[in-house]
């Protein structure tokens, strides 16, 4: 018996087609992805093959203005239109709190939404009961397939699930649910979830009875043969893991942003054992036409977005200096504003010993693309912010050793004075540079804001300590020459859309007046630009 698994993960509000790098589509003939194009390909496969499941491994939420405006209603609407068979909850599904998950998505989705390792308690237990499930038995042709869901147990640090949801260890939670499915004589079982490729592989290895793992969270690109676009494969598709009980378990993921449709064909014997598995992600490029009826629906929903982007979010009573002359040479107040927003967006009081789990932010000055003039009645709009942060990136959470941070700050000024983008803006960090010293030895003071304290204060950076830092995904991926971050990071979790983070902060503050306040200093009498 053959099953075709079509899968997406980490779509992050890319409802419309995007450019090759998943930012805003400029030249339509070279654009990719989007739900209208995805639907065309899905329908083509459904017509051609008998036993097809369309699955999503989480993080549909967060990523573009679509989510900012529609808050998840767009996810339910278009996933319903595409007739998804099941979805696992990702960490970003909790970005607007539990209510922001229940109302727009859990109550509106026509397909089951799954997670076996999230347990509700207190008053939430009855409110959320039955809205998401640990497992689902899906009838496909004359057979049934069990799907068990899982979600990153780091979600309380990455999003806003509140205090009434407990995120258990994935493997511990999955095993009893898989055992139940076996008891029901369901002998073909897919683990569908959102904990990253390393956990996906561990689930394949450790959870007895799981036949296939369909994952997300780490934006992992797997491919067999010559890859069709810019993404470099982390391994073959499917990635085969040998389980502790000796079975070959295929593990798949489909990069992110709806650029690819994962396509996996599994052949099962009559006892539900995997005989063979093969496939590849399908690049959703312009050779695949956008479905006209879905496209028309997208255009209808788009109207509200255009109206939103010109509405006032809040006011500034100071000039927001995002000029390259400032942000690539010294502390600039636009950099401070963005970093303050980044930290504010990551406030999670999950431990009594810590005022917050993260206190530090770094931001490449080259990523700040425009100032905002306060002389326009102080008005700040989404459109204004899109000029400041035009690349459609995310502000991510990483864990780094102090030694890596020191290298990053040395890199920040290794060729100072050439108006290059690697000069770092900061939050929760006090850095002093001496530009008279040779490159690689210019950081003379680096103090960081404590987290395990009731009164935050600055302490010298410790080289061997592990720190959490919020930074743009561009830096986490080694951009602007920050290879040491990419090479040495101990953990990387994708965060919220950059503009959304800043816009939310401005809306919350109502009136802003960021200052230049001595976060970045230059020692001695050395003149700087």
């Amino acid at each position: 018996w053959e099953l075709t698994i079509l899968h997406t993960n980490d779509v992050h509000s890319r409802l419309e087609q995007t450019s090759e790098d998943s930012s805003k589509c400029v030249n339509a003939s070279r654009c990719m992805g989007g739900v209208a194009r995805l639907f065309t390909k899905v329908q083509q496969i459904r017509r051609a093959e008998p036993n097809v499941l369309l699955l999503d491994a989480g993080d549909q939420y967060q990523g573009t203005i679509w989510f900012t405006v529609y808050k998840g209603a767009e996810v339910a609407h278009f996933m319903n239109a595409l007739r998804y068979d099941a979805m696992a909850l990702g960490n970003h599904e909790f970005d607007n709190g539990v209510e922001g998950l229940i109302e727009p998505l859990l109550k509106e989705a026509k397909f089951p939404i799954l997670s076996a390792n999230i347990k509700a308690k207190g008053p939430l237990a009855s409110q959320i009961s039955g809205l998401y499930l640990p497992y689902k038995v899906l009838p496909v042709g004359d057979e049934v397939v069990g799907i068990v869901g899982y979600t990153s147990k780091e979600t309380p640090f990455l999003s806003n699930p509140g205090t009434n949801l407990v995120f258990e260890d994935e493997i511990t939670a999955l095993q009893p649910e898989v055992d139940k499915l076996k008891t029901l004589n369901v002998n073909k079982i897919i683990a569908l979830g959102h904990s990253g490729f390393e956990m996906d592989k561990l689930i394949a290895q450790k959870v007895r009875g799981v036949d296939v793992v369909v994952g997300g969270h780490s934006n992992t690109f797997l491919y067999t043969g010559n890859p069709p676009s810019k993404e470099v494969p982390a391994g073959k598709y499917p990635f085969i893991v040998t389980s502790d009980d000796g079975r070959k378990v295929p593990v798949v993921q489909a990069y992110a942003f709806g650029k690819y449709l994962g396509y996996l064909k599994i052949e099962f014997d009559e006892r539900g054992n995997v005989i063979s598995s093969h496939g590849n992600p399908i690049l959703l490029n312009s050779s695949i036409p956008e479905d006209p009826s879905i496209k028309a629906d997208i255009n209808k929903w788009r109207i509200k977005l255009d109206n939103y982007s010109t509405q006032e979010l809040g006011k500034t009573i100071v000039y927001l200096d995002g000029s390259s002359q400032s942000c690539r040479f010294r502390e600039c107040n636009m950099g401070n504003l963005i970093c303050d927003a980044m930290i504010n967006n990551n406030l999670r009081h999950t431990d009594e010993m810590f005022w917050n789990h993260v206190s530090m932010c770094i931001l490449n000055g080259g990523g700040i693309r425009s100032p905002i003039d306060e002389r326009n009645n102080g008005t700040i709009t989404w459109e204004n912010l899109a000029a400041v942060l035009p690349f459609g990136g995310t502000f991510d959470l990483v864990q780094l050793k102090g030694s890596t941070l020191k290298k990053a700050f040395e890199h920040s000024v290794h060729r100072y004075g050439q108006s290059t983008g690697e000069f770092l803006q900061v939050g929760g960090i006090h850095v002093v540079y001496d530009l008279s010293r040779k490159p690689g030895d210019r950081v003379v003071k680096l103090d960081v804001l404590c987290t395990k304290c009731r009164v935050p204060s600055y302490d010298p950076l410790k080289m061997d300590e592990v720190y959490k830092v919020i930074l743009p995904n561009f830096l986490a991926n080694g951009g602007d020459g920050f290879q040491m971050i990419k090479d040495e990071l101990l953990r990387h979790d994708s965060g919220d859309q950059d503009i959304n983070v800043v816009s939310t902060y401005i809306s919350k503050m109502k009136v802003i007046y960021p200052a230049v306040e001595g976060r970045i200093k230059f020692s001695h009498h050395h003149h700087h630009h």
Epitope: L138, G141, T183
Partner: antibody, heavy 119, light 107 residues
Amino acid sequence: QVQLQQSGAEVKKPGASVKVSCKASGYTFTRYYIYWVRQRPGQGLEWIGWIYPGNFNTKYNEKFKGRATLTADTSASTAYMELSSLTSEDTAVYYCARDVYDYAGFAYWGQGTLVTVSS
Amino acid sequence: DIQMTQSPSFLSASVGDRVTITCKASQGVATAVAWYQQKPGKSPKLLIYWASTRHTGVPSRFSGSGSGTEFTLTISSLQPEDFATYFCQQYSSYPWTFGQGTKVEIK
């Protein structure tokens, strides 16, 4: 809250067919199986089959295969059970039901529809 | 088909009594067993699923146990509203089957 509202009692002649409806409310109809169970007068319970409104797949008790047909109308959140070639042995209360977790017990029941087969 | 045999078929008890109903499966069903309560003219009510998990809103005096072929439903202290017929059901193998029922009457 979850509710399953069934159609009213029916009297049918032997050899005829009957179609019982079950209107679901208080939850998303396409996400849960609908099960059909019958209870003959003074007897135990008998499982007829299930339908998954998410993709209209069905499973029948072999005893009813060929005579029972389960269907669903997702736009009306309604499931149907049609039983053909009725005999007096089919006189029973017919129930629709829904689970909490797939297959694991019938948590929500319709009020039942009495079908009487008599000449 | 798997036969589910309940015993006893009838049971007379008083308020406050501890009552145990057993259900034997003709072949192993692991823990895929549910228990229902039914009152005359009413639909059945789910009490227990997965052999021992109480359904939402079911009083704690109802408990289930067992696995494989032998299962029990226990009412720790019988209340007036508990006089009814109780059915077990297996959902491990098709066709899903029910026990013939145990009627609990007032002594």
